[in-house]
Structure formats: C-alpha cells, structure tokens
C-alpha cells in the first residue's frame, strides 16, 4: 500500500517517502526503489536553512556599501549573511536592505534611546526642569542649573530649550 503521508524530514513523491535534504544541501535526485535521495552541498556564496527539497540554493544577501551596509555576520551554507549599517546609519526596514542617517533630536528634545545599526534615535520632549539647546543624536535633556547651590538667584527662567540664567542676590541694606 503506497503511503499518503510521510514522517518528519521526508516528502512524498511517486507514491514513496523520500528523505528531505539537510540544511546546507540542495536536492539533486529524488529517491527511488534502489537509492536514497541525492543531495549536494550549497556552494560558498549560497545557503539553505531548512530541511528541504529545493533544487537551487539561495544566494547569500549582499551587504552593499553604497547603501551604507556592512557584514555583521558572514553567511554559511546553512545561514544567510546578516547585514548591518555603517556607523551613524540605521536600517530603513526590518529586512535591512538600505540604511539612512540617524535622526537628531531638535532643541527642546533630548535623546531617550541612542540609535543602533537597526533602530533610529528615539527622542523625548524635555520635561520641566530640563532643556536641550542643540540638535543632537546623542545628547540627553540636561537639568537646569541650580542657582541656589551656587548661592545665586534665578534671573531668567529656563525653558525646554534654554537653561536658567543665574545672577547675584540683591544685597539687603
């Protein structure tokens, strides 16, 4: 009785169960009554990452420097190449096919999370008591100067973009 379903790591063809090719190898010939499935290793620039019956291996991803990409992890016969972005850039999408410069946080905003090769800068508005007067991809909101600790008084209130201005206390006569 020919099988209608096969075990794990097998496939059904010509009414018989054949072994799938292991990761890193492609199918050359299906099994027969006399021989097991024939598989061959993927070439150096190719890979297959699952048990398969593919007749062609997949090409490793190319990390194009013109798109700001570099190799984070070299591909093997069983894994694809992993690309990441050059310093100062991050991936445009999850598949990381190209890179864009990290955004800077404008004055009034500080860096909540510094960008990585795969994620952009996350900015946050400076809360009361903090300010940022620069456009930066690294600077957090800085606290206003404490005039009191310097034995000074506030002459000009701070904003989210400016620090307080301290001055000497008025002398009492």
């Amino acid at each position: 009785e020919p099988p209608t379903a096969c075990r794990e790591k097998q496939y059904l063809i010509n009414s018989q169960c054949c072994s799938l090719c292991q990761p890193g190898q492609k199918l050359v010939s299906d099994c027969t009554e006399f021989t097991e499935t024939e598989c061959l290793p993927c070439s150096e620039s190719e890979f297959l990452d699952t048990w398969n019956r593919e007749t062609r291996c997949h090409q490793h991803k190319y990390c194009d420097p013109n798109l700001g990409l570099r190799v984070q992890q070299k591909g093997t016969s069983e894994t694809d190449t992993i690309c990441t972005c050059e310093e100062g850039l991050h991936c445009m999408s999850e598949s990381c096919e190209s890179c864009v410069p990290h955004r800077s946080c404008l004055p009034g905003f500080g860096v909540k999370q510094i960008a990585t090769g795969v994620s952009d800068t996350i900015c946050e508005p400076c809360p009361v008591g903090f300010f940022s007067n620069v456009s930066s991809a690294f600077e957090k909101c800085r606290p206003w100067t404490s005039c009191e600790t310097k034995d000074l008084v506030v002459q000009q209130a701070g904003t989210n973009k400016t620090d307080v201005v301290c001055g000497p206390q008025d002398r009492q006569r």
Partner: antibody
Framework: EVQLQQSGPELVKPGASVKIPCKAS????????MDWVKQSHGKSLEWIGD????????IYNQKFRGKATLTVDKSSSTAYMELRSLTSEDTAVYYC??????WGQGTLVTVSA | EIVLTQSPTTMAASPGEKITITCSAS???????LHWYQQKPGSSPKVLIY???NLASGVPVRFSGSGSGTSYSLTIGTMEAEDVATYYC?????????FGGGTKLEIK
Amino acid sequence: EVQLQQSGPELVKPGASVKIPCKASGYTFTDYNMDWVKQSHGKSLEWIGDINPNNDISIYNQKFRGKATLTVDKSSSTAYMELRSLTSEDTAVYYCARRFAYWGQGTLVTVSA
Amino acid sequence: EIVLTQSPTTMAASPGEKITITCSASSSISSNYLHWYQQKPGSSPKVLIYRTSNLASGVPVRFSGSGSGTSYSLTIGTMEAEDVATYYCQQGSSIPYTFGGGTKLEIK
C-alpha cells in the same frame, strides 16, 4: 521493454582516454538517473557515479573523481562515461545501469601498450 | 563509506539444499536500500531482491531476503543447478553506493 545498449570492447593505450556510450530505450530517458559500475576481472562491483539527465548533475565516488566524467545527450537518449589517463588498473568491464534496476551488457576496456 | 562484508566468500551446495548468505554492514542502513543481485558468468548483474525482502519480477519464490540495521541475509529455499552464480549485496542508502565482495555459489 527497457534496454541499455553498450558498445563493444575497447583496446586502448596507457595514458589515452576512452568514451563509452550507453543508449537507453523503452522508457523516458530523463525520468531516471544513470549509474556506472566497474568490475575488474574476478572482482566485485564498484560504483563510479551517477548522472541525472534532467539537470546534468553528476555525483561521483571520490575514488573515481578525476578519472571518470559522466555526460548525457538527451536528444539521442545516450549516457556517456569518459575515462582518462588510463592505466592497467583501469582494465575492467564497465556497466551502465538505470538506477540499478536495469543493466547494460557491459563494455570491456583493456589498457595495454 | 559503508563497507559490506559478505559470507561465505564461496560455497558449494547440493541440489535441494537450503542456502543462506549473509551481508554485514559497517554502519546501519535503511532496510529500504539494501538489495541483492545475481551474476552468472559472462553476464551483467541482475536484481534478485530489492529493499531487503521484495522479490524482483520473474525471480523464483525460492529466493527470499530479510534483515535490518547492519545485518541482512539472502536465502535460497532449495538449491537448483541454475542458481550457480555469484551473489552480491548492495546499499543505496548513502554515497558512495557500495557492494559486498560477493558470494560464489557452486553445485556439489
């Protein structure tokens, strides 16, 4: 009826090459791999390799890499095995077989000066 | 590579006698891919039994096969004069495919 027709005996000089044909009939040539097997006089059988006529990919026994080259001509349903740099060690009967189920009658190759 | 060792290498039997030839593999083989061939002098090998125990078309029922893992056998229930030949086991489980050294069967 499946038939594999091989050529007659070959007498070749040491260092020369020989190309043995195996003409298939009675089935769709591209449906089955063709295997090649060596049998030295009074000895057992040795698998040389096989070729898939569908994709022209051949797989070799490591022992025969560089010695044997397998090819096919789909238009004439013929498989070929070329043996090169022949020595007396290559004197043997060579069989083609359709995945071991059907065998050719064999071709005797004698290497002698 | 998988080495197949056959025993005996040669044997002589009387007509009507029961014959058993064994084939031992150096590592385990899927029973789906162990086969037996008969070769008569001056002829090509002919499939006798495929996939351990399946009789090839036109082969007399006195031939049978069994086994699993690394141990396989071919049995001739009652020897006949026409069974004089060399018998080979072969594995198609892993490349390179290999054959046993052969068992030459003669008649007493």
